[in-house]
Interface confidence: low
């Protein structure tokens, strides 16, 4: 892609951050070995990646979590990659589901999501999970990013 | 990307290779339907992908393994994507963890890792696992690659 | 990539479609939040993505399925990303395997596949699974796509 000023590279990779908030939206930070190519993509409120230019983007997220079947709800652990475009409804782009482990105290599992989507200027993407308290925040376990084609 | 000579495509995809070595670093080969775009990325010592040009790269790995909870250690199976840059410490870029299966003799699981990272000239990336003897080397199950944005 | 007319962006993202066919090849549709950049990539017969231009492509698939160990065969659930090029071998590019869950009535699991491959003009890629009746077709759970480097 190695583009000129007219067409700069746009890419981001942010790192999960434990949060005391009870929201299902995961929190992220520009810490560790993160990527933020320029101001054409930004991390807003620690929760969403927002792009300034329209175009096709490969968007991905990885979530590692630790859960136990007996201690969790019947429903599986679900991670969702969601889109909010200005003046539009929020929508789910991608989801992955993993049934809780029978391992005790909890069993770790990792989910990876990724796909190519058209984003409008000002569009934001974020990651939702069924239970953020189960997410693993150790180095490299949970991350979120995008790259503009 | 379809770039000119000044800015060639740089991409690699290599295939897992069973190894008698006891190291936790996975071994790879240019075999089967592999990709090696040019000499700006190379597979060194069968274990690491090394790049000659600085820039943003999407790096990924997939590891399929077969393990059993009773026959394995308490700790989960962990796959790590690691970076070694000239004159710098090694660091973990991405990790995924899966608790061992209760299936017998072993239960298969697949892990996928991927993210966008800035690499320096001469930087190498490699994949570590907790138990290489559990990795599946059948066609397509375990692979490793990158592409330059 | 933001390319000129000589070198347009080529990308696709299609959404899983439940099928009454007994074939192991998954069916896809241009529905929901899909991507089809132009006619240089097409979805043929609802089952394969076919490209018109030679080059390196990042190809990916995500499959979510729900299965139970007692109700399924001994063999794990396997998803395969396959390639058919004119006058060449049909071949497996990537595979992932997950042992069936012990959860009842079934346990959900998600598989992600992705890698960089050289495609010839007229080459088609498709996704095979061991049991298509176990695949989850809820919003965002199962998808398939590619992007040209």
């Amino acid at each position: 892609m190695q583009k000129g000023d007219q067409n700069p590279q746009i890419a981001a990779h942010v790192i999960s951050e434990a949060s005391s908030k009870t929201t299902s939206v995961l929190q992220w930070a520009e810490k560790g070995y993160y990527t933020m190519s320029n101001n054409l993509v930004t991390l807003e409120n620690g929760k969403q990646l927002t792009v300034k230019r329209q175009g096709l983007y490969y968007i991905y997220a990885q979530v590692t979590f630790c859960s136990n079947r007996e201690a969790s709800s019947q429903a599986p652990f679900i991670a969702s990659l969601c889109l909010k475009s200005p003046g539009r409804f929020e929508r789910i782009l991608l989801r992955a589901a993993n049934t809780h482990s029978s391992a005790k105290p909890c069993g770790q599992q990792s989910i990876h999501l990724g796909g190519v989507f058209e984003l409008q200027p000002g569009a934001s993407v974020f990651v939702n999970v069924t239970d953020p308290s189960q997410v693993s925040h150790g180095t490299g376990f949970t991350s979120f990013g995008l790259l503009k084609l | 990307m379809q770039k000119g000579d000044q800015n060639p495509q740089i991409a690699a995809h290599v295939i897992s290779e069973a190894s008698s070595k006891t190291t936790s670093v996975l071994q790879w080969a240019e075999k089967g339907y592999y990709t090696m775009s040019n000499n700006l990325v190379t597979l060194e010592n069968g274990k690491q992908l090394t790049v000659k040009r600085q820039g943003l790269y999407y790096i990924y790995a997939q590891v399929t393994f077969c393990s059993n909870r009773e026959a394995s250690s308490q700790a989960p199976f962990i796959a790590s994507l690691c970076l070694k840059s000239p004159g710098r410490f090694e660091r973990i870029l991405l990790r995924a963890a899966n608790t061992h299966s209760s299936a017998k003799p072993c239960g298969q699981q697949s892990i996928h890792l991927g993210g966008v990272f800035e690499l320096q000239p001469g930087a190498s990336v490699f994949v570590n696992v907790t138990d290489p003897s559990q990795v599946s080397h059948g066609t397509g199950f375990t692979s490793f690659g990158l592409l330059k944005l | 990539m933001q390319k000129g007319d000589q070198n347009p962006q080529i990308a696709a993202h299609v959404i899983s479609e439940a099928s009454s066919k007994t074939t192991s090849v998954l069916q896809w549709a241009e529905k929901g939040y899909y991507t089809m950049s132009n006619n240089l990539v097409t979805l043929e017969n609802g089952k394969q993505l076919t490209v018109k231009r030679q080059g390196l492509y990042y190809i990916y698939a995500q499959v979510t399925f729900c299965s139970n160990r007692e109700a399924s065969s001994q063999a794990p659930f396997i998803a395969s990303l396959c390639l058919k090029s004119p006058g060449r071998f049909e071949r497996i590019l990537l595979r992932a395997a997950n042992t069936h869950s012990s959860a009842k009535p079934c346990g959900q699991q998600s598989i992600h596949l992705g890698g960089v491959f050289e495609l010839q003009p007229g080459a088609s890629v498709f996704v095979n699974v061991t049991d298509p009746s176990q695949v989850s077709h809820g919003t965002g759970f199962t998808s398939f796509g590619l992007l040209k480097l």
Partner: nanobody, 114 residues
Framework: EVQLVESGGGLVQPGGSLRLSCAAS????????MGWFRQAPGKEREFVAA???????SYADSVKGRFTISADNSKNTAYLQMNSLKPEDTAVYYC????????WGQGTLVTVSS
């Protein structure tokens, strides 16, 4: 130099069987995928079967259940067992070795006729 030499072709009656062999030399056999193609008179060469370096097989729909491909790494040889042969299987059968490049044998003629 890569060399592929086919053998085992011949005349067989419908419903009969043949086993083709492809002896390979000049490359690391276990690092390559081996396959068979065929070309009937007046037609284009078409894929028949392939076996990957990991032992995974694939077949053209027209031969599934009748033909079996295999490879013996110790002998650097690939095989195509052809059962329940039909007149439409008549063709020159070519062995192929493929990694990033493609190498062909010279072909062996299979004629299915009563």
């Amino acid at each position: 130099e890569v060399q592929l030499v086919e053998s085992g072709g011949g005349l067989v009656q419908p419903g009969g069987s043949l086993r083709l062999s492809c002896a390979a030399s000049g490359f690391t056999f276990s690092r390559y995928e081996m396959g068979w193609f065929r070309q009937a008179p007046g037609k284009e060469r078409e894929f028949v079967a392939a076996v990957t370096e990991g032992g995974t097989t694939s077949y053209a729909d027209s031969v599934k259940g009748r033909f079996t491909i295999s490879a013996d790494n110790s002998k650097n040889t690939a095989y195509l067992q052809m059962n329940s042969l039909k007149p439409e299987d008549t063709a020159v059968y070519y062995c192929a070795a493929e990694s990033l490049g493609r190498w062909w044998g010279q072909g062996t003629l299979v004629t299915v006729s009563s």
